[in-house]
Interface confidence: low
């Protein structure tokens, strides 16, 4: 007769491992008992369990509650056992020794491999600001057995670097993603992808990038100077900028306080019916936690009467 087993049995941490051992004998041969032992090199064999044809299953105290026979119906020549809830310490060599009648004793070895799926964690780097050089955007760490693969999935241009730390029964892999921050990266996803034979599908953790910036400020509203004349209603200046975090706006007048009746509404400066008193230099001050910007414009309110008077003078002068 001979023993049928597997060279390697692979399970995921927490799963039940079936350790196969089947005696294929000649007719009339009987299996008296099957002894299972841990048989790692450099250590004495440690008994796991013994299946006795008369007395049933005996389990070592170290494996109490964790070793069972497969559910019925059972073949009397089948010495397989179930190792419940495999942990990584179970990984190693196992020996099945079958005592038969009348053929004697047979033994076989198998290796149990316990896959430890990684539980990845993603840690964002320091705050990203436009103008910085190459900066750590995020690091992703996953520990497992065997060592997991850690990669990045993103549309953002950057560089990656990985390092691995080996432990006695596992390996931790850390991958870092570096980039040169720019405002176009705002809101872009950066996804850490962890692959491992113990995972049914890749694990993905997504981090949304936030890049602090403040655009140059500009003022709109003076495109047609002829519209800025005495008596005009609804005149306004609008300050244009953008930033992350969103900026706040402040209006001042460089050559004195804001004239009465001028309304500040966030990025907009609203004027009452224009008078020459509204002529002056106006400054829009834009700021966020990252930076601040100024933009100034000169408002010159035309007085039609003054202009027509000048024209008359010119005519009379000729």
């Amino acid at each position: 007769g001979e023993l049928e087993t597997s060279d390697v049995v692979t399970v995921v941490l927490g799963q039940d491992a079936k350790l196969p051992c089947f005696y294929r004998g000649d007719s009339g041969e009987q299996v008296g008992q099957v002894a299972w032992a841990r048989a790692d090199a450099g250590e004495g064999a440690q008994e796991l369990a013994l299946l006795h044809s008369k007395y049933g299953l005996h389990v070592s105290p170290a494996y109490e509650g964790r070793v069972e026979q497969p559910p019925p119906p059972r073949n009397p020549l089948d010495g397989s056992v179930l190792l419940r809830n495999a942990v990584q310490a179970d990984e190693g060599e196992y020996e099945c020794r079958v005592s038969t009648f009348p053929a004697g004793s047979f033994q076989a070895r198998l290796r149990l491999r316990v896959l430890v799926p990684p539980l990845p964690s993603l840690n964002p780097g320091p705050a990203l600001e436009e103008g910085q050089g190459l900066t750590l955007a995020a690091s992703c760490t996953a520990e497992g057995s065997p060592a997991p693969s850690v990669t990045w999935d993103t549309e953002v241009k950057g560089t990656t670097s990985s390092r691995s730390f080996k432990h006695s029964r596992s390996a931790a892999v850390t991958s870092e993603f570096h980039l040169v921050p720019s405002r176009s990266m705002n809101g872009q996803p950066l996804t850490c992808v962890v692959s491992h034979p113990g995972l049914l599908q890749d694990q993905r953790i997504t981090h949304i990038l936030h890049v602090s910036f403040l655009a140059e400020a500009s003022v709109r509203g003076l495109e047609d100077q002829n519209l800025w004349h005495v008596g005009r209603e609804g005149a306004m200046l609008k300050c244009l900028s953008e930033g992350q975090p969103p900026p706040s706006y402040n209006w001042t007048r460089l050559d004195g306080p804001l004239p009465s009746g001028v309304r500040v509404d966030g990025d907009t400066l609203g004027f009452p019916p224009l008078t020459t008193e509204h002529s002056g230099i106006y400054v829009c001050h834009v700021s966020n936690e990252f930076s601040s910007r100024d933009s100034q414009v000169t408002v010159d309110v035309l007085d039609p009467q003054e202009d027509s008077g000048k024209q008359v003078d010119l005519v009379s002068a000729s």
């Epitope: 942990v87 964690s121 432990h167």
Partner: nanobody
């Protein structure tokens, strides 16, 4: 030694909500994974949801979209928000947490709570 104590169970009508809490007697910062299992009468204990120290979550297919696991390290508490409850959610819910062994090796030390009963019935 960390002790886990569940609360928040009770009787609720189908479609209702419950929020289970799991308070730890010690810090959960060292907890690698924390989660909730449940065991219905005559059935095997099954995993409901887990959450890693980094906040990544995993759910059993049967509760996806209905249950939400969260964790408050500052208050040493893990929560399970259960919405749209069904009669088949009736079970004893157990909180669990595991710690990595020395130097990050995988020889998990697992802690269990005593469980809290959730009954979904009209």
């Amino acid at each position: 030694q960390v002790q886990l104590v569940e609360s928040g169970g009770g009787l609720v009508q189908p479609g209702g909500s419950l929020r289970l809490s799991c308070a730890a007697s010690g810090s959960i910062f060292s907890m690698n994974v924390m989660g909730w299992y449940r065991q219905a009468p005559g059935k095997q204990r099954e995993l409901v949801a887990t959450i890693t120290s980094g906040g990544s979550t995993n759910y059993a297919d049967s509760v996806k979209g209905r249950f939400t696991i969260s964790r408050d390290n500052a208050n040493n508490t893990v929560y399970l928000q259960m919405n749209s409850l069904k009669p088949e959610d009736t079970a004893v819910y157990y909180c669990t947490g595991d710690q990595l062994g020395p130097l990050g090796t995988f020889s998990p030390i697992v802690y269990w709570g005593q469980g809290t009963q959730v009954t979904v019935s009209s």
